[in-house]
Interface confidence: low
């Protein structure tokens, strides 16, 4: 006969980064024991194993160690799967296959979603605007999934559909950044609204911009930033300093402050119309509101990531305007190297051994140096590889091949060129024959 396996009909909707439960249940017969149970979760399309329970034991996750069963509930027929730290790539169908004496299976769909950020609005050109000018308004919203629907309307709520170009680009995590561009001819003034809708979450994020043609600026504001790059450790907060000299009688209502990425012109943070308009950069930026009136336009960037590295432009407009760019150099210290030996037992003088030095999660790429016990550099037969993880941090693996003497010490030094931080490890090989690591 067939075992009845039950799963929800509707897709399970899970936010990126959260945990999801894929429900699956069966009805155990009286006297059922877990020793009889074979439970397999697999990807429906590819049949790739995700998680299994067999021979009375949880066989563990075969899916990047992000899955778990509910062991205390299995005996009651609860075969549900917990999927941790959901990613876009997890989206799809999962099959729950239960076998006792009989067997049955059913498939449950996982729909991944991520909310879009509040849109940021930029204007091009953004000065010397007069009625009749054609302007380009860009509405940008970040890190959502799945692809968004974008709607424009004017101040009266009338939809604007002509001259709209929308592009959506997925990042390495599969999340979308949406950029929608509206081209309009200015009236005396006007309000333009952009709405970004997530079709799965039915979440709307909207922003608007009101354009009032302005008179031409007459001179330049001197904007000062540090000449040297600001060095920030991954995960810490960084201050990008920027200052200007306010004139007597200056009021914040006169100030337009924009921080943007120098290369892409992506808006990072803005202060306009006497108000902090907030972060357009993953909600990780802040100004120093109490210091703005004194001419301090610095930007605080929180939880620095490798991807933040680059140049940021501070743009200040009062009656006049000026701008300057500051560079952010991101860094992360390398871990103390771990050393491994191959082969690692029955070693004798004259044997060729491979010593591997591994150091993790540093940035930028490391410099690796080997030396012997006398401090003499070892450069021959060294192969070093560096691989970036999803956060852009590097794991470095350096392999040294040497012919053993009677004994010897081999040291590996991993240097972070930005932090001027050295991390080193060494291994001493003595005696014959020997085993590494030494047995207790």
């Amino acid at each position: 006969g067939a075992l009845e396996v039950q799963v929800p009909e509707d897709p399970v909707v899970a936010l990126v980064g959260t945990d999801a439960t894929l429900c699956c249940s069966f009805s155990p017969e009286p006297g059922f024991s877990l020793a009889q149970l074979n439970l397999i979760w697999q990807l429906t399309d590819t049949k790739q194993l995700v998680h299994s329970f067999a021979e009375g034991q949880d066989q563990g996750s075969a899916y990047a160690n992000r899955t778990a069963l509910f062991p205390d509930l299995l005996a009651q027929g609860n075969a549900s799967l917990r999927l941790q730290r959901v990613r876009v790539a997890d989206e799809g169908s999962f099959t729950c296959f239960v076998s006792i004496r009989d067997f049955g299976s059913a498939a449950v769909s996982l729909q991944v979603a991520a909310p879009y950020s509040k849109p940021s609005m930029t204007l091009e050109p953004n000065k010397d605007l007069r009625p009749g000018d054609t302007v380009t308004i860009t509405c940008s919203s970040y890190q959502g999934y799945p692809e968004a629907e974008v709607f424009w309307q004017d101040g009266q709520g009338v939809p604007l559909t002509g001259n709209v170009t929308t592009s959506q680009m997925a990042n390495e995590q599969g999340l979308f950044d949406v950029h929608s561009i509206l081209r309009v001819v200015l009236g005396a003034n006007g309000t333009y609204s952009c709405l970004v809708r997530n079709p799965v979450l039915q979440q709307d994020a909207h922003s608007s911009v009101t354009i009032t043609p302005q008179r031409s600026p007459t001179g330049a504001v001197e904007v000062q930033v540090p000449e040297d790059p600001v060095v920030a450790l991954v995960g810490t907060d960084a201050t990008l300093r920027c200052s200007f000299s306010p004139e007597p009688g200056f009021s914040l209502a006169q100030l337009n402050l924009i921080w943007q990425l120098t290369d892409t012109k992506q808006l990072v943070h803005s202060f306009t119309e006497g108000r902090d308009q907030g972060s357009a950069y993953a909600n990780r930026t802040a100004l120093f509101p109490d210091l703005l009136a004194q001419g301090n336009a610095s930007l605080r960037l929180q939880r620095v990531r490798v991807a933040d590295e680059g140049s940021f432009t501070c743009f200040v407009s009062i009656r006049d305007f000026g701008s300057a760019a500051v560079s952010l150099q991101v860094a992360a210290p390398y871990s103390k190297p771990s050393m491994t030996l191959e082969p690692n037992k029955d070693l004798r003088p004259g044997d060729t051994v491979t010593i591997t030095c591994s150091s993790y999660r540093g940035y930028p790429e490391a410099e690796v140096f080997w030396q012997d016990g006398q401090g003499v550099p070892l450069t021959g037969n060294v192969t070093t590889s560096q691989m970036a993880n999803e956060q852009g941090l590097f794991d470095v693996h350096s392999v040294l091949r040497v012919v053993l003497g009677a004994n010897g010490t081999y040291s590996c030094l991993v240097r972070n060129p930005v932090l001027q931080q050295d991390a080193h490890g060494s291994v001493t090989i003595t005696g014959q024959p020997m085993t590494f690591p030494p047995e207790a």
Epitope: T46, Q48, A170, E172, G174, F176
Partner: antibody
Framework: DVQLVESGGGVVRPGESLTLSCAAS????????VSWVRQAPGEGLEWVSG???????YYADSVKGRFTISRDNSNNTLYLQMNSLRAEDTAVYYC??????????????WGLGTLVTVSS | EVVLTQSPGTLTLSPGERATLSCRAS??????LAWYQQKPGQAPRLLIY???TRATGIPARFSGSGSGTEFTLTINSLQSEDFAVYYC??????????FGGGTKVEIK
């Protein structure tokens, strides 16, 4: 029936550019990941670049900054724009479909390939 | 990147014999390994994925095994059409997706 047909190969000089096309039929190109895989004469297979169903692009280190993968959903075609070509880029270039939306997977369908020769 | 090493480079056998092809990964790739067959002048053809699962239309004489770093493709009772080059490919750690150097199975 799923089919992939590559075109655009030919003989070029070092430093020149070439664009390869891969016309797909039997499936929607933005519902699956598709990659370019190359094979130098008498050598093994080397993955070059991939684009996922959602549009994420990846490149091998050997071509990063020189090659650009793209697709046109309206005509179900994949492209590989190859700039600054080198002699070591000489190979048969295959278009290969992954059997799911994310590109990091095995390839269940392959085209017949198109030969690119870079020679002075 | 994950390096895949295939051995032997060439395997010389007679029809009806069993072929055992090895693929070793430089670090664990769990079961994210596929095998392909390629004949001269043709594109590769998928044989096995997820280490053990035969692709559609692949005869039962082809089987895969292994996990972690050691993988094997076995062809029981070689047929004349099985003489070709075989490649393994990992899709666990990426980018890049990587292939082994290939094993040529030729007729004795």
């Amino acid at each position: 029936d799923v089919q992939l047909v590559e075109s655009g190969g030919g003989v070029v000089r070092p430093g020149e550019s070439l664009t390869l096309s891969c016309a797909a039929s039997g499936f929607t190109i933005n519902s699956y990941a598709v990659s370019w895989v190359r094979q130098a004469p008498g050598e093994g297979l080397e993955w070059v670049s991939g684009i996922s169903g959602s549009g994420v692009r990846y490149y091998a280190d050997s071509v990063k900054g020189r090659f650009t993968i793209s697709r046109d959903n309206s005509n179900n075609t994949l492209y590989l724009q190859m700039n600054s070509l080198r002699a070591e880029d000489t190979a048969v270039y295959y278009c290969a479909r992954s059997n799911k939306v994310t590109w990091n997977n095995f390839f269940d369908y392959w085209g017949l390939g198109t030969l690119v020769t870079v020679s002075s | 990147e994950v390096v895949l090493t295939q051995s032997p480079g060439t395997l010389t056998l007679s029809p009806g014999e069993r072929a055992t092809l090895s693929c070793r990964a430089s670090r664990s790739i769990l079961t994210s390994l596929a095998w392909y067959q390629q004949k001269p002048g043709q594109a590769p053809r998928l044989l096995i994925y997820n280490t053990v699962t035969r692709a559609t239309g692949i005869p039962a004489r082809f089987s895969g095994s292994g996990s972690g770093t050691e993988f094997t493709l076995t062809i029981n009772s070689l047929q004349s059409e099985d003489f070709a080059v075989y490649y393994c490919q990992q899709y666990y750690d990426w980018p890049p997706l990587t292939f082994g150097g290939g094993t040529k199975v030729e007729i004795k």
